[in-house]
């Protein structure tokens, strides 16, 4: 079954996928498609890379991490209800059949609706960032220590959307890197 | 004009080998995988074999697996089959088409006759 | 390997006629479903990817919806150039599979 990954409306998505190229700058092609894999490479291809570069991309579809080494996570930009659904990351390993394919499940939830009191600051606004799901942690952290005017409630709805991103490593830790060579 | 051209089809006996090739015009087949379909005479349609944008990637029927050989030279923009121990059940129309969406075929060629017989 | 099962084998309609084709897969193959149509002597055209997407310059007459294991293919008023077979593909998986053809004649 696909691995679960979740964002508000609103804010980006991050879907990760990952490979080890055999030596630095050696990268194999990758695509990312939405649906799940079909049987050669991607169907409703968003984004595209070869041996060298992104060689095709959609509005809102994007690559933040460093993909030349193997870091070919996608970033869905402002996403919508509709961005919900399957999405296939497919890494293109050369030989006779031997494509590795992700199948990873994109749950979009509406944006939560927290009210604001005169001295608290809207908590979307507050934490742009921190409503990504392609944050890093430290930085969170930090970010959270400096901004007193938030009220419990709202500590804990970050800790979940944390959370929620760092799911990201699950990927990792479940063995789904691929080594190449 | 976006278009796909068969050549090399012809009669062959039993054990015999064949290449075809495939002109595409129009486009550039680096940029997309190329497949290879047949249809026996007053059969229906059957996958033979696909290969990826730049070779590396190939992929077989299992009736064809080991003796068929799926290649391009996209400095030529030209996709082959070579067959080899042809067998009577490999007599069909043989056609070069372009996969699109991950494994649909919207263009086609007007396909080459093979005829494996003694 | 998938099997991908077409009805009816023959259909015969009039000039105008609502026609559906269904196709029925082995096993679920999401919308990754093809629909084409040939005509004798030529080579087979692409009507309908996706299961429900319509291929650039044909006729809206043509339609597809499914997914999962079953899937449909309908022409909304039949016209004497539709006289085909038609062929319902999957690409889901390896190896690459099609329907047996619906043959489509007129009345």
């Known amino acids: 079954s696909e691995v679960e990954y979740r964002a508000e409306v609103g804010q980006n998505a991050y879907l990760p996928c990952f490979y080890t190229p055999a030596a630095p700058g050696n990268l194999v092609p990758v695509c990312w498609g939405k649906g799940a894999c079909p049987v050669f490479e991607c169907g409703n291809v968003v984004l595209r890379t070869d041996e060298r570069d992104v060689n095709y991309w959609t509005s809102r579809y994007w690559l933040n991490g460093d993909f030349r080494k193997g870091d070919v996570s996608l970033t869905i930009e402002n996403v919508t209800l509709a961005d919900s659904g399957i999405y296939c990351c497919r890494i293109q390993i050369p030989g006779i059949m031997n494509d590795e394919k992700f199948n990873l499940k994109l749950v979009i939830k509406p944006a939560k609706v927290t009210p604001a009191p005169t001295r608290q600051r809207d908590f979307t606004a507050a934490f742009p960032r921190m409503l990504t799901t392609r944050g890093h942690g430290p930085a969170e952290t930090q970010t959270l220590g400096s901004l007193p005017d938030i009220n419990l409630t709202q500590i804990s709805t970050l800790a979940n959307e944390l959370r929620d991103s760092r799911l990201a490593n699950d990927l990792r830790d479940s063995g789904a890197t691929i080594r190449i060579g | 004009e976006v278009q796909l051209l068969e050549s090399g089809g012809g009669l062959v006996q039993p054990g015999g080998s064949l290449r075809l090739s495939c002109a595409a015009s129009?486009?550039?087949?680096?940029?997309?995988?190329m497949s290879w379909v047949r249809q026996a005479p007053g059969k229906g349609l059957e996958w033979v074999a696909a290969i990826s944008f730049d070779g590396s990637n190939k992929y077989y029927a299992n009736s064809v697996k080991g003796r068929f050989t799926i290649s391009r030279d996209n400095s030529k923009n030209t996709l082959y089959l070579q067959m080899n121990s042809l067998k009577t059940e490999d007599t069909a129309v043989y056609y070069c088409?372009?996969?699109?969406?991950?494994?649909?075929?919207?263009?086609w060629g007007r396909g080459t006759l093979v005829t494996v017989s003694s | 390997d998938i099997v991908m099962t077409q009805s009816p084998s023959t259909l015969s309609a009039s000039v105008g006629d609502r026609v559906t084709i269904t196709c029925r897969a082995s096993?679920?193959?999401?919308?990754?479903l093809a629909w084409y149509q040939q005509k004798p002597g030529k080579a087979p055209k692409l009507l309908i990817y996706?299961?429900?997407s319509l291929q650039s310059g044909v006729p809206s007459r043509f339609s597809g919806s499914g997914s999962g294991t079953d899937f449909t293919f309908t022409i909304s008023s039949l016209q004497p150039e539709d006289i085909a077979t038609y062929y319902c593909?999957?690409?889901?998986?390896?190896?690459?599979?099609f329907g047996q053809g619906t043959k489509v004649e007129i009345k």
């Open positions: 096993e679920s193959i999401s919308s990754w």
């Open positions: 996706t299961a429900s």
């Open positions: 593909q999957h690409y889901a998986n390896l190896p690459l599979t």
């Open positions: 088409v372009r996969v699109r969406d991950g494994g649909s075929f919207d263009l």
């Open positions: 129009g486009f550039t087949v680096s940029s997309n995988y």
